[in-house]
């Protein structure tokens, strides 16, 4: 449903838009000489923004620093200097502003303290930064305070001495619950998982760490793993990489019961120089990257079954640099099952790949209509779109932003890219998809910053330039037509676009500074689009769209992971407000099962271009190195297992004789003698 994009020409020009926006543009000049600015939103739909500006002068012996704190409660239209609430203290920017989960209204700022002090100092607010309480800590924090997702009064922090500290009353009082802690994370139900070093230090003991758990904020503990290299949480899975007995390799083990029982994941082991990485996880499954041996810069993506144990190879030669730890793996949140990432070809060129079925199949991104293939293409008529993401940004290419999608702006994906056989180092353009990545169109010429407002009702963009700017572009039809608005007569050096997370707001803040001979002055312009989208959207403004539709004639059209979804989406021609309370209207319907809805169970694989699972020849008649729940047991399988999250019903049910696979657990990861429980008495 899209034509070629146009800027200001033969587009449905919005009447009086300049007057409407001028009346809704608010400038705020920050009266300080700060070198850096950080901005945080406090709560959801509250309109509260905190801005921390810092100015640092490194002197010979000590460094002198000054912070200023500003607060807005109208989405950035006006700011008030509230530095006095934090006693004009210098705030450590490396800790950022620790904002509480959900709408708790909690904020913690960590202050800089003089060298000889007993501990650090924080400023705490629980009323959306209206007031702050100064609290001196009994330790020097190493990390930002971490809120429990379940209870924002519960905090944990690591100290510079590797102590694990916990507060049960939003940082008023603290208790050290364990020493020699390397890494700590909140789990579900206020559980804390952490690794401890036994002998020397976190670095020296890597691979010999112990994994501990406390379910009562440090009263009692349980050792749930030994010989740990690292651990991570993803969805409902707890992962640990564990050193092997016989060599320096390590393997992933998985638990779905907070570490009470573990299973060895059916993934390759990795050596000292390699790594595992959880790319994405949800309640159903996990995407796991396993690094290739050697400094190749790539590895393999595997997708898990519902237990997190059996893995299917999803994508080879997946780009993931060891040096900077960069991967382009992107979850397209505007459409279920869609992910985009990059692969590294034999010739070292980088290519974008997309999956629409949660990693089942990957393909190149379709060439945008009416686009020409660039110099990277061998065939000038056949090529694909390649997306710039984290890796391009890390390589300092002219890419100001990573791909953007929002769950409530269904189907919309915006990204920088080039059209050819591989990612190009030339200046990219901005492309948009309105169907979750199936089709693409050039949205804007050259690199831009962009953001989505009003659940997709407005897209805003600003050109990426070294020169001062004063123009903002916006589109009310998903990037087809663009209007330009001069938001100031005095151009600014642009530093960033800020809009409330969640893409429900109609306000956008343009941040930057003006520079004269000696001073740099921070300034923000907040533009409210409420008068552009004058009326609320009505029933007639929405149209039906079937996600994942590729063949309207096929009865399985739109079926992904066993069901299809019809959405009501805003018509491109409707200029109206979805509004803050907009809820995506979708109607799911279940699809009949086919072999595509099943993955191959342990000991089985799908030969190339086949749909049936066959027994792995190397496993016939062999005992398998596979550990389920840490004990020997028989595992019965018919070779198939439903893909995690698949909701298909009826149709094809892969029936075949049930095999009894004798499993031999070769991991001593949970040697009973190693298990212990302790009380913190």
């Amino acid at each position: 449903r899209r034509g070629a994009p146009a800027e200001d020409q033969d587009c449905g020009r919005l009447p009086d838009f300049i007057a409407k926006l001028t009346n809704n543009t608010h400038q705020h000049v920050f009266d300080d000489l700060s070198g850096s600015v950080s901005l945080s939103w406090v709560g959801d739909s509250t309109g509260v923004i905190l801005v921390l500006t810092t100015f640092q002068v490194p002197l010979v012996i000590v460094s002198f620093g000054q912070s200023k704190l500003y607060r807005s409660e109208d989405y950035g239209k006006n700011f008030k200097d509230i530095t006095n609430l934090i006693n004009n203290t210098f705030i450590r920017t490396e800790f950022g502003m620790a904002i509480g989960p959900e709408n708790s209204g909690k904020v913690i700022l960590t202050a800089e303290v003089s060298g000889g002090s007993r501990g650090g100092r924080v400023f705490r607010s629980s009323d959306f930064a209206k007031n702050f309480v100064q609290t001196d800590l009994p330790f020097h924090p190493l990390t930002q305070m971490m809120y429990s997702p379940q209870n924002s009064d519960y905090l944990l922090a690591l100290s510079t001495e590797n102590g694990l500290w916990v507060s049960k009353n939003f940082g008023e009082k603290w208790e050290e619950i364990h020493k020699a802690v390397c890494l700590a994370k909140w789990g579900p139900n206020n559980i804390i998982f952490f690794t401890t070093h036994v002998n020397g230090s976190c670095k020296a003991d890597l691979g010999a760490l112990e994994l501990w758990r406390t379910s009562d904020l440090g009263k009692t503990f349980k050792t749930i793993g030994v010989k740990i290299y690292s651990f991570g949480l993803g969805g409902r899975f707890l992962f640990a990489s564990v050193m092997a007995d016989k060599d320096t390799t390590r393997r992933i083990h998985v638990s779905t019961d907070q570490g009470d029982t573990w299973s060895m994941a059916q993934l390759p082991s990795v050596g000292q120089e390699q790594f595992y990485s959880i790319l994405a996880a949800n309640e159903d499954m996990v995407f796991m990257h396993v690094d290739e041996p050697g400094d190749t810069g790539f590895g393999t993506i595997f997708t898990s079954d519902d237990r997190g144990i059996v893995y299917s190879k999803s994508l080879d030669r997946h780009l993931y640099t060891t040096t900077g730890g960069e991967t382009d793996f992107t979850n397209v949140t505007s459409l279920r099952g869609v992910y985009i990432t990059s692969t590294l070809s034999e010739d070292n060129s980088i290519q974008s790949m997309i999956t629409f079925d949660q990693g089942g199949r990957w393909e190149h991104l379709r060439k945008p209509e009416n686009s020409k293939c660039d110099a990277t293409a061998k065939n000038k008529n056949e090529c694909s779109l390649h997306i710039h993401a984290s890796y391009s940004i890390s390589q300092k290419l002219n890419v100001p932003m990573a791909p953007l999608s929002e769950p409530n702006a269904v189907g919309i994906v915006i990204a920088h890219g080039s059209v050819g056989d591989a990612i190009s180092v030339m200046v990219p353009d901005v492309y948009i998809s309105d169907d979750g990545g199936y089709s693409w169109a050039k949205m804007l010429e050259g690199p831009h910053y962009y953001t989505i407002l009003d659940s997709g009702g407005i897209i805003v963009a600003i050109e990426h330039s070294n020169r001062p700017i004063n123009v903002i572009k916006f589109s009310t039809d998903e990037g087809q037509c663009w209007q330009s608005y001069v938001f100031t007569q005095e151009p600014i050096y642009f530093t960033g676009l800020a809009s409330e997370p969640g893409a429900r707001s109609m306000n956008i803040s343009i941040w930057g500074f003006t520079e004269s001979f000696i001073t740099r002055q921070w300034v923000s312009y907040t533009v409210d689009f409420k008068d552009i989208l004058e009326r609320n959207c009505e029933e007639d403004d929405y149209t039906t769209w079937l996600a994942h539709s590729t063949d309207p004639g096929d009865y399985k059209d739109g079926c992904i992971l066993g069901y299809k979804e019809q959405f009501l989406r805003l018509r491109k021609s409707s200029v109206c407000q979805n509004g803050r309370d907009y809820v995506v209207a979708k109607q799911p319907s279940v699809c009949p099962c086919s072999l595509e809805d099943f993955l191959c169970d342990f000991g089985y694989f799908r030969p190339e271009n086949a749909s049936e699972c066959v027994e792995q020849p190397e496993l016939k008649g062999h005992e398998l190195e596979f550990c389920l729940y840490g004990k020997e047991e028989h595992l019965t399988t018919n070779g198939y297992r439903k893909i995690p999250g698949d909701k298909c019903q009826g149709g094809m049910n892969p029936a075949r004789e049930v095999k009894d696979l004798k499993k031999k657990c070769t991991s001593n990861f949970l040697n009973p003698t190693k298990q212990n429980s302790k009380s913190n008495s």
């Epitope: 149209t543 039906t544 079937l546 539709s549 309207p552 004639g553 096929d554």
Partner: antibody, heavy 124, light 107 residues
């Protein structure tokens, strides 16, 4: 093959109601909108509204709001259009037409399969 | 409602002629314009959708162009079976509206 078969001609008195049926075959009924379009004798085409057979969701032209009701029975792949409080200027040929789909979009691409038409005559 | 104005309302042409029919929308409808052919006593038949895409089974002598507010249907070489009434229709904004029709007659 894909086809839409409509019910036979009707003669009605002013103030009465008429219900026209449209049976679909050769495709997945729920996967396409069903539009209703009418044509008065010697006149052009006039769109009345559509129904999404999958959800039952409807959209009517303002002119017919309150007088028209579009329904469907997915078990027999049939769509219905009922027009009440008939007047003499409702005399027309009534067509059902399948909305053409492009990818996932149900609207915007015209009507690619039409029924043969049902003549409704309103006369006292 | 969006008004669709077709011109001419009727035209006479000979077999082999190149025929052009225009359609103007009262406001921009992007490329959401479709063209139909209707013969007496028959249901309309979709020729062109999305301004310029040829419906499958329709001869290639039919073509469409335009976007925004001005659109054109062209028959490159008129054939005897092409004598009929042609309608444009916008499907961008509800309610869907049709043009008044252009009757192509034999000269």
């Amino acid at each position: 093959q894909v086809q839409l078969v409509q019910s036979g001609a009707e003669v009605k008195k002013p103030g009465a109601s008429v219900k026209v049926s449209c049976k679909a075959s050769g495709y997945t009924f729920g996967a396409y909108y069903m539009h209703w379009v009418r044509q008065a004798p010697g006149q052009g085409l006039e769109w009345m509204g559509w129904i999404n057979p999958n959800s039952g969701f409807t959209r009517y032209a303002q002119k017919f709001q309150g007088r028209v009701t579009m329904t469907r029975d997915t078990s027999i792949s049939t769509a219905y259009m009922e027009l009440s409080r008939l007047r003499s200027d409702d005399t027309a040929v009534y067509y059902c037409a399948r909305g053409k789909r492009s990818s996932g979009w149900y609207e915007g691409y015209g009507m690619d399969v039409w029924g043969q038409g049902t003549t409704v005559t309103v006369s006292s | 409602d969006i008004q669709m104005t077709q011109s001419p309302s009727s035209l006479s042409a000979s077999v082999g002629d190149r025929v052009t029919i225009t359609c103007r929308a009262s406001q921009s409808i992007s490329s959401y314009l479709n063209w139909y052919q209707q013969k007496p006593g028959k249901a309309p038949k979709l020729l062109i959708y999305a301004a310029s895409s040829l419906q499958s089974g329709v001869p290639s002598r039919f073509s469409g162009s335009g976007s925004g507010t001005d659109f054109t249907l062209t028959i490159s070489s008129l054939q005897p079976e092409d004598f009929a009434t042609y309608y444009c229709q916008q499907s961008d904004v509800s309610p869907i509206t049709f043009g008044g029709g252009t009757k192509v007659e034999i000269k």
